[in-house]
């Protein structure tokens, strides 16, 4: 996991300035006001592997 200045977060995650790391977009269901969730709204989720 790298800062936006280096490389983007992997699919299904978004950069959190508060936590200084990439965070799972899936966690926005429980914590929608997290700083990184704005970045998740613009990014598609990681696909299911069925």
């Amino acid at each position: 996991e790298q800062a936006p200045g280096n490389a983007p977060c992997s699919r299904g995650s978004s950069w959190s300035a508060d936590l200084d790391k990439c965070m799972d977009c899936a966690s926005c269901r429980a914590r929608p006001h997290s700083d990184f969730c704005l970045g998740c709204a613009a990014a598609p989720p990681a696909p299911f592997r069925l």
């Epitope: 299904g12 508060d18 936590l19 200084d20 965070m23 799972d24 977009c25 899936a26 966690s27 269901r29 429980a30 914590r31 989720p45 299911f48 592997r49």
Partner: antibody, heavy 119, light 111 residues
Framework: EVKLQQSGGGLVQPGGSMKLSCVAS????????MNWVRQSPEQGLEWIAE??????????HYAESVKGRFTISRDDSKNSVYLQMNNLRPEDTGIYYC??????????WGQGTTLTVSS | DTVLTQSPASLVVSLGQRATISCRAS??????????IHWYQQKPGQPPKFLIK???NRDSGVPARFSGSGSGTDFTLNIHPVEEDDTAIYYC?????????FGAGTKLELQ
């Protein structure tokens, strides 16, 4: 390196009390929900309590089995979480772990501390 | 509460073979985007170690031999090829609601 260092535990009589402590380091403690999970041969892994964030006035959640007897609290200035256990029963015997989660999964666990409730 | 049923309770696998562990939820724990099931490994005398989040995403440092799949109510943890160090008990956990519950565990042993 993330570390959750637990203390407390031991032998207590039925009806007695015990307080467990857990000191965290290596992550932004104030952003994480802190939990206690216990383990016993009878019940397996059993989540028992969670305390959330100051921004929401530290909401707490408890398993039905401990509601009204156990109290979870935290001190963000000390990176610490506590579990006050009152009116203890033999079925509360087990290994108690503190664990943190941002929202969903318990990514870090303490080393565990054993509580035995017996006369 | 959402009940998680794991099977089998114990599993004996030869070195290099595949271990398959099932976790079934009493209700759906998936949205259209994500599944709220997570997997842990526990060795004797140690706390559980987090392995896989959201059904299929390995934690950093977890070997690619570990993979998770599933959605809705049926989930699977696969370990292939199994190594000696994989002897442990494996647990699933949901985060769909409060309380978050765990499966009863599957004990993996090597033949």
């Amino acid at each position: 390196e993330v570390k959750l260092q637990q203390s407390g535990g031991g032998l207590v009589q039925p009806g007695g009390s015990m307080k467990l402590s857990c000191v965290a380091s290596g992550f932004t403690f104030s952003y994480y929900w802190m939990n206690w999970v216990r383990q016993s041969p009878e019940q397996g892994l059993e989540w028992i309590a969670e305390i959330r964030l100051q921004s929401n006035d530290y909401p707490t959640h408890y398993a039905e089995s401990v509601k009204g007897r156990f109290t979870i609290s935290r001190d963000d200035s000390k990176n610490s979480v506590y579990l006050q256990m009152n009116n203890l029963r033999p079925e509360d015997t087990g290994i108690y772990y503190c664990a943190c989660r941002y929202a969903d999964y318990f990514d870090h666990w303490g080393q565990g501390t054993t509580l035995t409730v017996s006369s | 509460d959402t009940v998680l049923t794991q099977s089998p309770a114990s599993l004996v696998v030869s070195l290099g073979q595949r271990a398959t562990i099932s976790c079934r939820a009493s209700q759906s724990v998936s949205t259209s985007d994500y599944s709220y099931i997570h997997w842990y490994q526990q060795k004797p005398g140690q706390p559980p170690k987090f392995l896989i989040k959201y059904a299929s995403n390995r934690d950093s440092g977890v070997p690619a031999r570990f993979s998770g799949s599933g959605s809705g109510t049926d989930f699977t943890l696969n370990i292939h090829p199994v190594e000696e160090d994989d002897t442990a008990i494996y647990y699933c956990q949901h985060s769909w609601e409060i309380p978050p519950t765990f499966g009863a565990g599957t004990k993996l042993e090597l033949q």
